[in-house]
C-alpha cells in the first residue's frame, strides 16, 4: 500500500492577510485565523512530517479584498509560489479581469501546473494561451505517480469575464477522455481537481471513471468528521464518500473557504491505484499555528501599497451621497440606487442575443449601507470612503429565485416599517409600491420587474412562478436580515465580487457620478 | 547561482557497478527533483530516471529497473546514480538533470564518461 | 512509451537563414515538451519549456510553437554561435523520452 497526503484550500478570495473569525478583517490578531503566513507554518509542519504531500487549490484565489484590487493576480502568483502549490485548478473568479487578467499576472508567473480541462480555446487566443494552463498533470510523487486533472463551473460566463473565445464544455463530457488517457499512460492514481460546486464534485465522483478522489471548490462547502472547531456547521462527513457508477467509494472533499481551513485527507492506494482508504479534516488555522516570519515580513512589504491605494480618488460624486440609516432603512436613497447600478454593471454579461442581459434585478439590505459619502469635500471619492460605506467585506452575489420568493423578500422588507431595521431593501431594476396600512405580509400592491429578454429595457409585472436572477449581498443569499426563505428558496447561487470592488470600479469607470432618487420605492397614498 | 557538480571519469569492468555523483549548489536541494540521463558516444540522449531529494522517492525508466538505484544526501545536497550489471553497451556519458518547477531540466551537471571495458 | 520523433536529423544552413526544427509524438503530449541545444563535449541547455516558453537568457531569436502531437523550434535568424545539435523531450508522462536530435551544420 501507499499513502499520498493531499493539503487543499480553495475559496480563498484574496485573503493573503490573517482574518477574523467571520473571515473579515482581522481586528484582535490574538483571535485571528488563516492567512498565507499561518497557511506556510502548517505546510511546512505537514511536508516534513510525512513523505508523500501535495498542496493544491481549487481555484478562486481572485477577488475578495483590496489585495486582489491593487496587485490585480500577482499577489496570488506571488505567494502560491512562495507556499510552493503542486496545482490549481482555474475558478470563475480567476476571470474577472477578462482573459488578460489571466495571462499576465498569473498563468506566466505561476511556478506550478494551473488546470481545467473543460475550457477550451478557440480564435486568436488558441495559439496566445496555448500551454498556459492544461486539461492536466502528472507528478512524481515520491515512488509514484499522480495525474490530477482540473475542471471549472461552466457558468463561468454568466459569473464572471472569459470573454468570447473561451468555451466551457461540460465537466463530466470533457474529464472522461483526459482521464482515459492517462489511464492508458499507467497513471493509475487520479486526482479531479476542480472549482463547479460541491454538486458537481459529487456527480464527477460519481460518473468520470477512474478518477479516484475529487478536491473540489466553489461551493464553499464545509465538511467534517467529529465536532467542528469554529463555527461553520458541516454539510456532511470528511471526507463525503460517492458511490461511482462503477461500484468504487470515491472521497470528495473541500475545505470551506478564505483560508480559514486547510484541508487534509490521506488516502491509501494498493498496487494497482485502487483507494483502500481514505480520512482526514480540515485543519483550523487559527492563533495556535503562528505565522511564519519570512512570508509575514513578506506580506508586510507588500501590505505598503495597499495603504496608499486606499487614500487614492477614484471618481468624483457631484451629489450627496445619502447612505444615512435614516434614509436607507426607509426609503429609497440615492446610495442604494448607486449601489445597485454598480452591482447590476458589474455583471454585464451579453451571452445570447435573445438578451439584452442575463440579469436585470438588484436588492440590497438598507442596514448593509454604513455612511453617507459628503460631495464638498472636492467630489472626491475614495476607497476608503466605501470601506465606511461597506464595511463587512461581503459579496455581490447572483442568485436565482422564483417570483413567488421574491414577493416573500419585499414582504419582509416592510413587515415592521418605521424601526430603522436593516431589512428594508433598496432595489435596481425593480419598481415596488407599498401601502403601509395593509397588514404586515399583504403590503407589496406593486411589484415590476426590468425585462432581460428584450432588445428594449421595459418594467413588466413580476410572475410568481417564473424563475428571475437577481444581484444581491452574500449576506442576503445566506438568510440575513430575516430574509429565510431567500436561502430557504434559491435555486441558485454564485458568489460574487467583492462589494466595494464592485462600487469602486463602477465609480472609476464613470469616473463623474450623480445618482438620483427616482421613483424605484414608492409608498401608495395615504399610508407614507 | 545553481551548479552542479559530477563525478569524475570512471572504467569499469563488464557485470560490475559504478556509482556516479553530483553535488548540488546554489538553490534549496530539496525543493527540485534530479533527472538522470545518459548519452553514449555519438547518440542522442536516455532518460534513466528521477529522484525527489525532499523524500528519497525514485521513478526509474523500466529499461534499467533492476539495474539502477537513485539515492540522495541532504546533508551534502548529493545526490547518487548507482548501475550495475555493467554491459559495453553502457558506455556513455551520465548527466544528472535538475527540473524546475513544470519538470523540465533546467540545470545540468558536466556529465561523466563511464566506460565499461574488459 | 511515447515515441518523439525529430526532424530533420541533419540541416545545413548560412548565418542569417531562417530554420525551423519540427518534433511529432505519438500522442498529446499536453504541451509539456521541452528544447535543448547541445555543442560538442558539453552537456544540453534548456532552450524552451512547455513547448513555447523561453528560459531566461535565451535569445529571442529562439521561439517554440505547436501543441497536441506537433512542435516546432524555430530561429529566426541564425548565429555562428547557433551550429549545435538540438534535442526536443517529451516529459508529459513516464518514461520522459528524447527526439532523436537535429544537427544544424554551417553551409
Known amino acids: 500500500a501507499w499513502e499520498l497526503t493531499i493539503l487543499h484550500t480553495n475559496d480563498v478570495h484574496s485573503r493573503l492577510e490573517q482574518t477574523s473569525e467571520d473571515s473579515s478583517k482581522c481586528v484582535n490578531a490574538s483571535r485571528c485565523m488563516g492567512g498565507v503566513a499561518r497557511l506556510f507554518t502548517k505546510v511546512q509542519q505537514i511536508r516534513r512530517a510525512e513523505p508523500n504531500v501535495l498542496l493544491l487549490d481549487a481555484g478562486d484565489q481572485y477577488q475578495g479584498t483590496i489585495w486582489f484590487t491593487v496587485y490585480k493576480g500577482a499577489e496570488v502568483a506571488h505567494f502560491m509560489n512562495a507556499l510552493r502549490y503542486d496545482a490549481m485548478a482555474l475558478g470563475n473568479h480567476e476571470f474577472d479581469n477578462g482573459v488578460e487578467g489571466l495571462i499576465e499576472p498569473l498563468l506566466k508567473e505561476a511556478k506550478f501546473p494551473i488546470l481545467s480541462a473543460n475550457i477550451k480555446a478557440k480564435g486568436p487566443l488558441a495559439s496566445q494561451i496555448s500551454g498556459l494552463y492544461l486539461p492536466y498533470k502528472v507528478l512524481p510523487v515520491g515512488d509514484e505517480v499522480v495525474g490530477i486533472v482540473g475542471y471549472t463551473s461552466k457558468e463561468t460566463p454568466f459569473l464572471s469575464n472569459p470573454g468570447t473565445n473561451l468555451v466551457f464544455e461540460d465537466e463530466i463530457t470533457a474529464l472522461q477522455p483526459e482521464v482515459d488517457k492517462l489511464k492508458t499512460l499507467n497513471v493509475n492514481k487520479i486526482i479531479a481537481l476542480g472549482h463547479s460546486g460541491f454538486e458537481m464534485d459529487k456527480l464527477i465522483a460519481q460518473k468520470v471513471r477512474g478518477v479516484d478522489v475529487v478536491v473540489g471548490g466553489h461551493s464553499n462547502t464545509f465538511l467534517y468528521t467529529g465536532n467542528p472547531p469554529s463555527k461553520e456547521v458541516p454539510a456532511g462527513k470528511y471526507p463525503f464518500i460517492v458511490t461511482s457508477d462503477d461500484g468504487r467509494k470515491v472521497p470528495v472533499v473541500q475545505a470551506y473557504a478564505f483560508g480559514k481551513y486547510l484541508g487534509y485527507l490521506k488516502i491509501e492506494f494498493d498496487e494497482r491505484g485502487n483507494v483502500i482508504s481514505s480520512h482526514g479534516n480540515p485543519i483550523l488555522l487559527n492563533s495556535s499555528i503562528p505565522e511564519d516570519p519570512s512570508i509575514k515580513a513578506d506580506i508586510n512589504k507588500w501590505r505598503i501599497k495597499l495603504d496608499n491605494y486606499s487614500t487614492q480618488e477614484l471618481g468624483k460624486t457631484i451629489v450627496y451621497l445619502d447612505g444615512s440609516s435614516q434614509s436607507c432603512r426607509f426609503r429609497e436613497c440615492n446610495m442604494g440606487n448607486l449601489i445597485c447600478d454598480a452591482m447590476i454593471n458589474n455583471n454585464l454579461r451579453h451571452t445570447d442575443e435573445m438578451f439584452w442581459n442575463h440579469v436585470s434585478m438588484c436588492i440590497l439590505n438598507g442596514g448593509g449601507i454604513r455612511s453617507p459619502i459628503d460631495e464638498r469635500n472636492n467630489g472626491t471619492i475614495t476607497w476608503e470612503n466605501l470601506a465606511a460605506v461597506l464595511p463587512f467585506g461581503g459579496t455581490f452575489d447572483l442568485v436565482q429565485l422564483k417570483g413567488s420568493t421574491l414577493k416573500k423578500a419585499f414582504e419582509h422588507s416592510v413587515h415592521r416599517y418605521g424601526q430603522s431595521t436593516g431589512e428594508f431593501l433598496q432595489v435596481g431594476g425593480i419598481h415596488v409600491v407599498y401601502d403601509l396600512s395593509r397588514k404586515p405580509g399583504d403590503r407589496v400592491v406593486k411589484l415590476d420587474v426590468l425585462c432581460t429578454k428584450c432588445r428594449v429595457p421595459s418594467y413588466d409585472p413580476l410572475k410568481m412562478d417564473e424563475v428571475y436572477k437577481v444581484i444581491l449581498p452574500n449576506f442576503l443569499a445566506n438568510g440575513g436580515d430575516g430574509f429565510q426563505m431567500i436561502k430557504d428558496e434559491l435555486l441558485r447561487h454564485d458568489s460574487g465580487d467583492q462589494d466595494i470592488n464592485v462600487v469602486s470600479t463602477y465609480i472609476s469607470k464613470m469616473k463623474v457620478i450623480y445618482p438620483a432618487v427616482e421613483g424605484r420605492i414608492k409608498f401608495s397614498t395615504g399610508s407614507h | 547561482q545553481v551548479q552542479l557538480q559530477e563525478s569524475g571519469a570512471e572504467v569499469k569492468k563488464p557485470g560490475a557497478s559504478v556509482k556516479v555523483s553530483c553535488k548540488a549548489s546554489g538553490y534549496t536541494f530539496t525543493d527540485s527533483n534530479m533527472d538522470w540521463v545518459r548519452q553514449a558516444p555519438g547518440q542522442g540522449l536516455e532518460w534513466m530516471g528521477d529522484?525527489?531529494?525532499?523524500?528519497?522517492?525514485?521513478i526509474y525508466n523500466q529499461k534499467f529497473k533492476g539495474r539502477v538505484t537513485m539515492t540522495r544526501d541532504t546533508s551534502t545536497s548529493t545526490v547518487y546514480m548507482e548501475l550495475s550489471s555493467l554491459r559495453s553497451e553502457d558506455t556513455a556519458v551520465y548527466y544528472c538533470?535538475?527540473?524546475?518547477?513544470?519538470?523540465?531540466?533546467?540545470?545540468w551537471g558536466q556529465g561523466t564518461l563511464v566506460t565499461v571495458s574488459s | 512509451d511515447i515515441q518523439v520523433t525529430q526532424s530533420p536529423s541533419f540541416l545545413s544552413a548560412s548565418v542569417g537563414d531562417r530554420v525551423t526544427i519540427t518534433c511529432k509524438a505519438s500522442?498529446?503530449?499536453?504541451?509539456?515538451l521541452s528544447w535543448y541545444q547541445q555543442k560538442p563535449g558539453k552537456a544540453p541547455k534548456l532552450l524552451i519549456y512547455?513547448?513555447?516558453r523561453l528560459i531566461d537568457g535565451v535569445p529571442s531569436r529562439f521561439s517554440g510553437s505547436g501543441s497536441g502531437t506537433e512542435f516546432t523550434l524555430t530561429i529566426s535568424s541564425l548565429q555562428p554561435e547557433d551550429f549545435a545539435t538540438y534535442y526536443c523531450q517529451q516529459y508529459d508522462v513516464f518514461p520522459r523520452t528524447f527526439g532523436g536530435g537535429t544537427k544544424v551544420e554551417i553551409k
Open positions: 529522484i525527489n531529494p525532499n523524500n528519497g522517492g525514485t
Open positions: 538533470a535538475r527540473t524546475n518547477w513544470d519538470y523540465a531540466m533546467d540545470y
Open positions: 500522442q498529446d503530449i499536453n504541451s509539456q
Open positions: 512547455r513547448a513555447n
